[in-house]
């Protein structure tokens, strides 16, 4: 049986229904069987877990996703073996295997792989600071969301209107969420906001930086 699945990965927003398309061509016999299984990201296919079987005219959802899986067409004997997964969770991200067996059609292994990413908006990030907050010193402002798929990008902005910092004194990394402030001056003091963004939305946190004379330094 030759199985056809989309070549592009599938993305579905958190809580929505994912439709994992799988089709095939064969003269369906009484021995026809369909199995859908799931493997977590980064794990080998050999570690897949069954989530649904169809055999002998009956459908058998199985495992932790059993209440949320069904077939677009039941029985799946018309050439369409598409899986529906409702109320998707972050843990549903991974590779899904559609395997069709129909002896004596052994033309190929009857296997198709679909990568699903569950899209999750960024959670409220945590803002933190480390380093010297005295004039002339350097400090790192960090920002990180514990949730978000795809991984959020981070953008730091200083709130209010202040003199433009000298070039090179403010360097940020959108991937790590880190903002490096060098050669601090009293005018570096203020509130800094980090915005974590992905295609599902954004979330932010704020941090107030107080730059002091060299004898003392603190962050509120």
């Amino acid at each position: 049986v030759e199985v056809k699945v989309p070549t592009e990965p599938l993305s579905t927003p958190l809580g929505k229904t994912a439709e994992l398309t799988c089709t095939y061509s064969t003269s369906v016999g009484d021995s026809f069987a369909l199995e859908w299984s799931f493997v977590q990201p980064g794990k080998p296919i050999s570690e897949s877990h069954p989530i649904l079987y169809f055999t002998n005219g009956h459908l058998y959802p199985t495992g932790s996703k059993s209440k949320r899986v069904s077939l677009l067409q039941n029985p799946p004997t018309v050439g369409v073996a598409t899986l529906k997964l409702t109320d998707v969770h972050p843990s549903d991200t991974g590779t899904y295997l559609c395997q069709v067996n129909n002896p004596p059609d052994f033309y190929t292994n009857g296997l198709g792989l679909i990568n699903l990413t569950v899209l999750v908006p960024p959670s409220n990030p945590l803002c933190s600071q480390s380093g010297q907050t005295s004039v002339g010193g350097s400090t790192a402002l960090r920002c990180s969301s514990s949730e978000g798929a795809p991984k959020p990008v981070y953008n730091w902005v200083r709130l209010g209107t202040f003199p433009t910092p000298s070039p090179g004194s403010m360097v940020q990394d959108e991937v790590s969420g880190q903002l490096i402030l060098t050669n601090l001056s009293l005018t570096s003091s203020g509130t800094y906001r980090c915005v974590a963004t992905n295609q599902m939305g954004s979330a932010s946190c704020e941090l107030t930086l107080s730059v002091t004379e060299p004898s003392q330094g603190r962050v509120a």
Epitope: S25, S27, V28, G29, P75, V78, P104, Y107
Partner: antibody, heavy 118, light 107 residues
């Protein structure tokens, strides 16, 4: 040599019923998916039903669903098509056809004519 | 349902001609396409399946090509026995449907 011989065609009134038969020989019937395909006079081909090797799975297009029933008796090497609530547009030559491993039709019978007319 | 459209509907040709018939599917059917030949009063005969595979006994002057939505049947050198009607059929997902046919007649 593969042989498929249809029978049971004839003239029937609209709303009436008819049962077609197909006698198969020359191959292992119980291992083969089978179909009925029809052809209205002067028109093209239309698939009307299929059945899996052991009869567990049957399929129909919308045009006949609920009116036609395909069945088989592997002990008798026979395929059947029960046609109910017949309409004028069901008038056609009905062919019995064997399916290959993929659902194309590698052997066909000679056909039997069904005429639905008052 | 997947619609199959053949062109031309009728084709006039002479013995020895190279003849090409086109079949288009309304959506991607990969290579799941069969071709049949039918003569008046006779049952269809399988010529090609999987878009390009010839069953045993079909003359090599017949060939098929294409994938996705566009397919062709070619007769490299038309013989007297080839004057007939030709049908394409997708063998992908149910319902399996046929093209409306192409009649190859003597010019």
């Amino acid at each position: 040599e593969v042989q498929l011989v249809e029978s049971g065609g004839g003239l029937v009134k609209p709303g009436g019923s008819l049962r077609l038969s197909c006698a198969a020989s020359g191959f292992t019937f119980s291992n083969s998916g089978m179909s009925w395909v029809r052809q209205a006079p002067g028109k093209g081909l239309e698939w009307v039903s299929s059945i899996s090797d052991g009869g567990l799975y049957t399929h129909y297009p919308d045009s006949v669903k609920g009116r036609f029933t395909i069945s088989r008796d592997n002990a008798k090497n026979s395929l059947y098509l029960q046609m109910n609530s017949l309409r004028a547009e069901d008038t056609a030559v009905y062919y019995c056809a064997r399916q290959g491993v993929r659902p194309f039709f590698d052997y066909w019978g000679q056909g039997t004519l069904v005429t639905v007319s008052s | 349902d997947i619609q199959m459209t053949q062109s031309p509907s009728t084709l006039s040709a002479s013995v020895g001609d190279r003849v090409t018939i086109t079949c288009r599917a309304s959506e991607n059917i990969y290579s799941y396409l069969a071709w049949y030949q039918q003569k008046p009063g006779k049952a269809p005969k399988l010529l090609i399946y999987n878009a390009e595979t010839l069953p045993e006994g079909v003359p090599s002057r017949f060939s098929g090509s294409g994938s996705g939505t566009e397919f062709t049947l070619t007769i490299s050198s038309l013989q007297p026995d080839d004057f007939a009607t030709y049908y394409c059929q997708h063998h992908y997902v149910i319902p399996w449907t046929f093209g409306q046919g192409t009649k190859v007649e003597i010019k």
